[in-house]
Amino acid sequence: EEELQVIQPDKSVLVAAGETATLRCTATSLIPVGPIQWFRGAGPGRELIYNQKEGHFPRVTTVSDLTKRNNMDFSIRIGNITPADAGTYYCVKFRKGSPDDVEFKSGAGTELSVRAKPSAPVVSGPAARATPQHTVSFTCESHGFSPRDITLKWFKNGNELSDFQTNVDPVGESVSYSIHSTAKVVLTREDVHSQVICEVAHVTLQGDPLRGTANLSETIRVPPTLEVTQQPVRAENQVNVTCQVRKFYPQRLQLTWLENGNVSRTETASTVTENKDGTYNWMSWLLVNVSAHRDDVKLTCQVEHDGQPAVSKSHDLKVSAHPKEQGSNTAAENTGSNERNIY
């Protein structure tokens, strides 16, 4: 028993960020005379939150009218709570002293914990595109949440991924926390329409997790397959040769025709057709005037896709009196670096 007790009935209070925290405090006596002050923390570095005697505390309101006669309720409300407000709050009775007021009795303290929602997860992929069968890393980041407990999952097209590593920082006590996760994803040729999803679940989200997405269309490069074929004669002394460029992504592609190694024509893919899997097909044709050639003609379709080293396919055109349709059975010639060395 004491002549004056400061009672803080709540050991802890949990408040969502943006809301108002109510910190309760009553005194059992008004004697001795002196103000109540609220502090965050204890010891010499404590922070003054409210002083009944003087000062301007715009975020703080008193629950009771402290000018009301013989009021012994010194509870306060703190508005617009942020994670930075977390800590232990002490209601402290001072007594008049000479010359300064003297700390007389402190409440046991109320720990204010702030529930703060995580920010929307941001998923980012590799800086450069990669081809199917390669493994790429995606990162997911979310910030500003509290308490520290959080769950993060990765999905690819609805299927949960297991190859990922997650860190929550800082390790020790903090007003708010951040999560960082890196997932490894193996690309397939069908991934143009695929999505990678990072899903974050936290107590503040009430069972409705936040999601961040990345489209693999931003990450994948599907190299084209080439097929050069000779079409039936269109006119006397003319042969139509087509180059089928199939299953490529992204669309950025430049094709060059070579006749016996000399550039005949260069064009950029424009009117492409899209496949169900999101890849593109394109066809280019070359009209060859056979009479202009005495010898056999080697036609090469050379494709530079998405800034990568060129790949090519050739077709030998036999010069004869009656040209007939010929299929292409020659092997592709790689005129640049190996097409797999692309990143």
């Epitope: 002549e3 004697i31 005379v33 002196g34 005697k53 402290l66 006669r69 013989n70 009021n71 000479s98």
Partner: antibody, heavy 114, light 111 residues
Framework: QVQLQESGPGLVKPSQTLSLTCTVS????????VNWIRQPPGKGLEWIGI???????DYNSALKSRVTISKDTSKNQVFLKLSSVTAADTAVYYC????????WGQGTTVTVSS | DIVLTQSPASLAVSPGQRATITCRAS??????????MHWYQQKPGQPPKPLIY???NLESGVPARFSGSGSGTDFTLTINPVEANDAANYYC?????????FGGGTKVEIK
């Protein structure tokens, strides 16, 4: 129940130091302050000072240079020392609990005389 | 120092009548929404007995015949109705400012 009892010599010579003891029961001296008050014969009450639960003290400025209040919590005792006494210090001396002065001792009479 | 002036210095009241004692402070004894003025009753050979604290609050065990009022500098102790054993000296006291001070006292006699 709460009790306070003053004790000390009933007669003190002028210029000497008056020493009184207040022995308390029913409450803790760490939780409550104790006042000293005096009342000269046929006159009103005069507050001398208080020792708080944390052992800090406040004194009547008119007596501050001569008065010391201390305590021995383990013995439940509060002490008053008043130095350089004169006949004007003749009074009944009371101890009373807390800032509220809700419990009083019966008082002890101190006469200053040679 | 805050000087407390009580009036009257003495009064004689018949049983069943009302007795009113005033206490005027040289400066306000109000702080933080309360008046730090208290009243005591003292009978001969006895220590003072608390009656009223914080201007108007009755101490436990004190009959409801006693009441206190006032704020700032002017305070009143009322005994209604007066009984024979109310004969005593009555003191006001402030502990709003150091040094804590008492009024000079009012002697109540029963006719």
């Amino acid at each position: 129940q709460v009790q306070l009892q003053e004790s000390g010599p009933g007669l003190v010579k002028p210029s000497q130091t008056l020493s009184l003891t207040c022995t308390v029961s029913g409450f803790s001296l760490t939780g409550y302050g104790v006042n000293w008050i005096r009342q000269p014969p046929g006159k009103g009450l005069e507050w001398i000072g208080i020792i708080w639960g944390d052992a800090s003290t406040d004194y009547n400025s008119a007596l501050k240079s001569r008065v010391t209040i201390s305590k021995d919590t383990s013995k439940n005792q509060v002490f008053l020392k008043l130095s350089s006494v004169t006949a004007a210090d003749t009074a009944v001396y009371y101890c009373a609990r807390a800032g509220k002065m809700d419990y009083w001792g019966q008082g002890t009479t101190v006469t200053v005389s040679s | 120092d805050i000087v407390l002036t009580q009036s009257p210095a003495s009064l004689a009241v018949s049983p069943g009548q009302r007795a009113t004692i005033t206490c005027r402070a040289s400066e306000s004894v109000d702080s933080y929404g309360s008046s730090f003025m208290h009243w005591y009753q003292q009978k001969p050979g006895q220590p003072p007995k608390p009656l009223i604290y914080l201007a108007s609050n009755l101490e436990s065990g004190v009959p409801a015949r006693f009441s206190g009022s006032g704020s700032g500098t002017d305070f009143t102790l009322t005994i209604n109705p007066v009984e024979a054993n109310d004969a005593a000296n009555y003191y006001c006291q402030q502990n709003n400012e150091y040094p804590w001070t008492f009024g000079g006292g009012t002697k109540v006699e029963i006719k």
